[in-house]
Amino acid sequence: APVRSLNCTLRDSQQKSLVMSGPYELKALHLQGQDMEQQVVFSMSFVQGEESNDKIPVALGLKEKNLYLSCVLKDDKPTLQLESVDPKNYPKKKMEKRFVFNKIEINNKLEFESAQFPNWYISTSQAENMPVFLGGTKGGQDITDFTMQFVSS
């Protein structure tokens, strides 16, 4: 059965946009004007996971690329990566846990918690041009709040 998906961009709470940094990494930086076209467009798929009024499980693929954000252990630390998948099999309604994020809406802001590693969140640094990463703290220096902008198909 087909998976419900939508196209969107994400900006952190400081209005930094997400762009590709090499083939398998995202970074966050402020963009303006025509540079906004550099930001990545996600295909957000609604998938199996814990669902409630303010929590929706999603997978974040890069639109028209066979790449998904995934959470894995590297050197015993939960780590965010872009993982290549077989486009014939993805997206699917029941994704492997490493691809699943709990999209949590709080006060019109979004958090993306790893389903594989509870209490670890997609994060950006205060500094410009730094990698998007998986962070284990909320409310500290690092930014875990995002806004979503819908993109027409």
Epitope: A1, P2, Q48, E50, S52, E96, K97
Partner: antibody, heavy 119, light 107 residues
Framework: QVQLQQWGAGLLKPSETLSLTCAVY????????WSWIRQPPGKGLEWIGE???????NYNPSLKSRVTISVDTSRNQFSLSLSSVTAADTAVYYC?????????????WGQGTLVTVSS | QSVLTQPPSVSVSPGQTASITCSGD??????AFWYQQKPGQSPVLVIY???KRPSGIPERFSGSNSGNTATLTISGTQALDEADYYC?????????FGGGTKLTVLG
């Protein structure tokens, strides 16, 4: 309170087609997936397939060539058809609901229908 | 075909802890679910998404899932917990059940 009530022929001859229907009472029909599972006597559970309100299906590969699951949203019903049955298809057949709030798994089940295939 | 392997039987004394395992290739990268089935009855969901309990399921039921093994744990096992238990997970496009474990509460 959600209730799933199922019915269909309980005795079949080899090569005939098994037909079962499940009616859903209470709760929305369109927000869920609807599944069929079977259990041969004294054995474990086997997932047959599922359908959503729009008619999109997933089937167990081992049964796919013989199975059709259909839906009638106007009646809040869904049905199972299994063709060319043999004695190996003798089982209790269950219908069930897969809910997003439980991670798209089977949170409500029908009472089960014993289907016997015998010549 | 994907395979989920469970021990055919587990025995436990009343009040003790029962652990039922379910093993499968990279099972920890999928979500695991557990059902309880008593004789002549339809299965009942007792654990979903690895470790969550549906409303009405007692707190003594818990679950975990990592590596290649999911585990259903029943602490302070009671006589009424005697039943068959099935694990389940998703395999690409279809659901797979384990073979089932008969839990016997001794005494």
């Amino acid at each position: 309170q959600v209730q799933l009530q199922q019915w269909g022929a309980g005795l079949l001859k080899p090569s005939e087609t098994l037909s079962l229907t499940c009616a859903v009472y209470g709760g929305s029909f369109s927000d869920y997936y609807w599944s069929w599972i079977r259990q041969p006597p004294g054995k474990g559970l086997e997932w047959i397939g599922e359908i959503d309100h729009s008619g999109s299906t997933n089937y167990n590969p081992s049964l796919k060539s013989r199975v059709t699951i259909s839906v009638d949203t106007s009646r809040n019903q869904f049905s199972l058809s299994l063709s060319s049955v043999t004695a190996a298809d003798t089982a209790v057949y269950y219908c069930a609901r897969a809910s997003p709030s439980s991670g798209w798994t089977l949170d409500y089940w029908g009472q089960g229908t014993l289907v016997t295939v015998s010549s | 075909q994907s395979v989920l392997t469970q021990p055919p039987s587990v025995s436990v004394s009343p009040g003790q802890t029962a652990s039922i395992t379910c093993s499968g290739d990279k099972l920890g990268d999928k979500f695991a679910f557990w059902y309880q089935q008593k004789p002549g009855q339809s299965p009942v969901l007792v654990i979903y998404l690895d470790n969550k309990r549906p409303s009405g399921i007692p707190e003594r039921f818990s679950g975990s899932n990592s590596g290649n093994t999911a585990t259903l744990t029943i602490s302070g096992t009671q006589a009424l917990d005697e039943a068959d238990y099935y694990c389940e997970a998703w395999a690409d496009t279809y659901e797979v059940f384990g073979g089932g474990t008969k839990l016997t509460v001794l005494g």
